[in-house]
């Protein structure tokens, strides 16, 4: 259970413990959400494929002043091998589609849960 197989990404694949912590944080965000997350801020949708961690960070880093996702941003930066700054975009962004942060987190959570299961059972 040290790492997740079957998932190509630039840079290291997060160990299952780190991935588990990220999922737990996203679960906390979705469960504790009362008002619209990050005041309903919109972010670029991403392809949930290789390089997803950097793409997710590139999308979320453009949301400022939202304490609810600051821990997620820090965790994602640990999974991304290069430095990401606001305004940066990779080919993984679906540049014509913006979604609310809450939906982005929900989609990311579902995908990471799937990756976690794959890592556990393969």
């Amino acid at each position: 259970l040290t790492c997740l197989g079957g998932f190509a990404s630039p840079g290291p694949v997060p160990p299952s413990t780190a991935l588990r912590e990220l999922i737990e944080e996203l679960v906390n965000i979705t469960q504790n959400q009362k008002a619209p997350l990050c005041n309903g801020s919109m972010v670029w949708s991403i392809n949930l494929t290789a390089g997803m961690y950097c793409a997710a960070l590139e999308s979320l880093i453009n949301v400022s002043g939202c304490s609810a996702i600051e821990k997620t941003q820090r965790m994602l930066s640990g999974f991304c091998p290069h430095k990401v700054s606001a305004g940066q975009f990779s080919s993984l962004h679906v540049r014509d589609t913006k979604i609310e942060v809450a939906q982005f987190v929900k989609d990311l959570l579902l995908h990471l849960k799937k990756l976690f299961r794959e890592g556990q059972f393969n």
Epitope: L1, E118, F121
Partner: antibody
Framework: EVQLVQSGAEVKKPGATVKISCKVS????????MHWVQQAPGKGLEWMGG????????ASNQKFKGRVTITADKSTDTAYMELSSLRSEDTAVYYC?????FGGGPFAYWGQGTLVTVSS | DIQMTQSPSSLSASVGDRVTITCKAS??????LSWFQQKPGKAPKSLIY???RLVDGVPSRFSGSGSGQDYTLTISSLDPEDFATYYC?????????FGGGTKVEIK
Amino acid sequence: EVQLVQSGAEVKKPGATVKISCKVSGYTFTDYEMHWVQQAPGKGLEWMGGIDPETGGTASNQKFKGRVTITADKSTDTAYMELSSLRSEDTAVYYCATGDYFGGGPFAYWGQGTLVTVSS
Amino acid sequence: DIQMTQSPSSLSASVGDRVTITCKASQDINSYLSWFQQKPGKAPKSLIYRANRLVDGVPSRFSGSGSGQDYTLTISSLDPEDFATYYCLQYDEFPYTFGGGTKVEIK
């Protein structure tokens, strides 16, 4: 409402193979892992193994020394547990269990159990 | 494999009593622990997950606590329907392992 319905009781001879089914409803089958648990008469619970229904990837308890095969049929939302080379010590109730690892835990929901009796 | 040592193996108590059951893991299980209640002839029922989170629909008299290797299930005031056998389970790593069980009997 999440439901897990297991196949009926079985009587088998030593050396035979038993295959138990667990049909699920009330959630998307591929969203949760599925596990199998053994409980011998008057004894505690023992994890046998589990499966990710999405990929078919499995994990199992070495105690069963490769005698356990766990499969999942996505087309019928049914998981299966096959136990081969049966011996008298395999007489037990077998349960399937499932759940969201991060929201309720992987054993949040249980089947009703299937009694397998191994006798010559 | 991670060993789960549950104690006591049995206890006698009266309705209204506070009951505490403990589980000790042979290594840190990161709070990936569940508690179950089982009555004779029935499937186990999930009570607590992630060491301290109450499963929906479970009465608030049940609570879980602990971290690292040591975990506790507490029933604050025993109800007649609480007489049963209780099991802990670690799901931090494979193979998942259960405690030996604690039978709660009527005094």
